[in-house]
Interface confidence: low
């Protein structure tokens, strides 16, 4: 059958783990994904696949501040196909393809759910440390943390309340630590969200699990 053009091309990306998804399921044809590098060369990925997703993490982590272009080519199974690096042709013609929206990892990757590494209520201070989670971005063979990638552009929002109250307060920091003034002898429950200050959309992560200071732990299981 004649290959159908892919549609609903969508980037699914969290902490730079990045997959391009699309529809429909192919019949009698396959897909090949191409992604442009910084030299604007097209690189073939997920060559001749019947899947409707392609993991492009290895490509996009090379430079998370680059706006990547990608396309999904629909390739007939029965025709002779020649793929040589940058070229993919069927009898001298490029197969039908659909462009994905541009993907700029620094701006577009979702932030994963943060983890509260430690917390302590010490008199009138509630001290909270958020784990600096690893990303899939590498530098000199080492995976970088969120903080190493985003620097001071990464912040955290803490939302907290007295254990027995419904009224909430928030605080923002651009480090991984909070020190909040609280009432002595009163227990507090809180959760944190990561945020990227420079973003227009997609700015906040999901909230962490809610945790409470000592006296309230038993009530929350």
């Amino acid at each position: 059958g004649i290959p159908e053009k892919a549609f609903n091309l969508t980037w699914i990306s969290t902490d730079f783990k990045t997959i391009l998804e699309w529809q429909p399921k192919p019949t009698n044809y396959t897909y090949t994904v191409q992604i442009s590098d910084r030299s604007r060369n097209w690189k073939n990925k997920c060559f001749s696949t019947t899947d409707t997703e392609c993991d492009l993490t290895d490509e996009i982590v090379k430079d998370v501040t680059w706006a990547y272009e990608a396309k999904v080519l629909s390739v007939p199974r029965r025709n002779s196909v020649h793929g040589d690096g940058d070229q993919l042709v069927i009898h001298g013609e490029e197969p039908p393809f659909t462009n994905a929206p541009k993907f700029l990892p620094y701006r577009d990757t979702n932030l994963g759910q943060p983890v509260i590494q430690q917390f302590e209520q010490n008199g009138r201070k509630l001290n909270v440390v958020v784990k600096d989670s690893l990303t899939l971005v590498r530098k000199n063979g080492t995976f970088l943390t969120l903080r190493q990638v985003f620097g001071k552009d990464l912040g955290y929002i803490i939302t907290y309340r007295k254990g027995s109250s419904t009224g909430k307060k928030t605080n923002i920091t651009n480090t991984n630590e909070f020190s909040i003034d609280v009432e002595e002898g009163v227990s507090y429950c809180f959760f944190v969200q990561a945020m990227i200050f420079s973003r227009k959309t997609n700015q906040n992560s999901p909230g962490s699990s809610t945790v409470c200071t000592e006296q309230w732990k038993s009530f929350l299981g």
């Epitope: 680059w66 701006r107 530098k139 620097g151 227009k200």
Partner: antibody
Framework: QVQLVQSGAEVKKPGESLKISCKGS???????IGWVRQMPGKGLEWMGW????????RYSPSFQGQVTISADKSISTAYLQWSSLKASDTAMYYC??????????WGQGTLVTVSS | DIELTQPPSVSVAPGQTARISCSGD??????VSWYQQKPGQAPVLVIY???NRPSGIPERFSGSNSGNTATLTISGTQAEDEADYYC?????????FGGGTKLTVLG
């Protein structure tokens, strides 16, 4: 207070090389530094940026291959250099702390005059 | 890549409201910042992320951005606001400035 201090004005001949500097007075390595050109009587043009922590750079296509941006994080200084100046390089050059479309603190500018 | 277009000049009487536009394809989906530059001086950031004012910038400066147009609004314009104003945004790994608008405060 964030401060960027640029090197002084330069007068050069066509074909000469030049390196101008921008010294930061804050946590230099964890911020991007951008460079912006302003030709006489004209508007602002983004040239490129550097992340001094690992010297990663990005250039505007208009300036790629025309200039080199570098940094020495040990002395909190970024540089903009030319290997062979042209008369059309005559302009005011600004460095600024940079964050993707946002230049929040600017140096005082370095005037470069190229004339035979 | 996006191109930003500004009017070359805008005039306003002291105390009146000045509006400087910056247009570009689908600009509302990008963050826009605004810079003020007085003669012989370096630019100064006056609005960032569409409508945020850095500390030290007077409240009379405000910004908006939707559709294809971002606008810098100066309420109760003062003589000292006479300057060139530039909009800027970030697209496809490139920073883009508008061509600039000369604001003249009459009188």
């Amino acid at each position: 207070q964030v401060q960027l201090v640029q090197s002084g004005a330069e007068v050069k001949k066509p074909g000469e090389s030049l390196k101008i500097s921008c010294k930061g007075s804050y946590s230099f390595t964890s911020n991007w530094i951008g460079w912006v050109r302003q030709m006489p009587g004209k508007g602002l043009e983004w040239m490129g940026w550097i992340y001094p922590s690992d010297s990663m750079t990005r250039y505007s296509p208009s300036f790629q291959g025309q200039v080199t941006i570098s940094a020495d994080k040990s002395i909190s200084t970024a540089y903009l250099q030319w290997s062979s100046l042209k008369a059309s390089d005559t302009a005011m050059y600004y460095c600024a702390r940079y964050l993707f479309g946002l230049f929040d603190n600017w140096g005082q500018g370095t005037l470069v005059t190229v004339s035979s | 890549d996006i191109e930003l277009t500004q009017p070359p000049s805008v005039s306003v009487a002291p105390g009146q409201t000045a509006r400087i536009s910056c247009s570009g394809d689908n600009l509302g989906s990008y963050y826009v910042s605004w810079y003020q530059q007085k003669p012989g001086q370096a630019p100064v950031l006056v609005i960032y992320n569409d409508n945020n004012r850095p500390s030290g910038i007077p409240e009379r400066f405000s910004g908006s951005n939707s559709g294809n147009t971002a606008t810098l609004t100066i309420s109760g314009t003062q003589a000292e606001d006479e300057a060139d104003y530039y909009c800027a945004t970030y697209d496809s790994s490139t920073d883009v400035f508008g061509g600039g608008t000369k604001l003249t405060v009459l009188g």
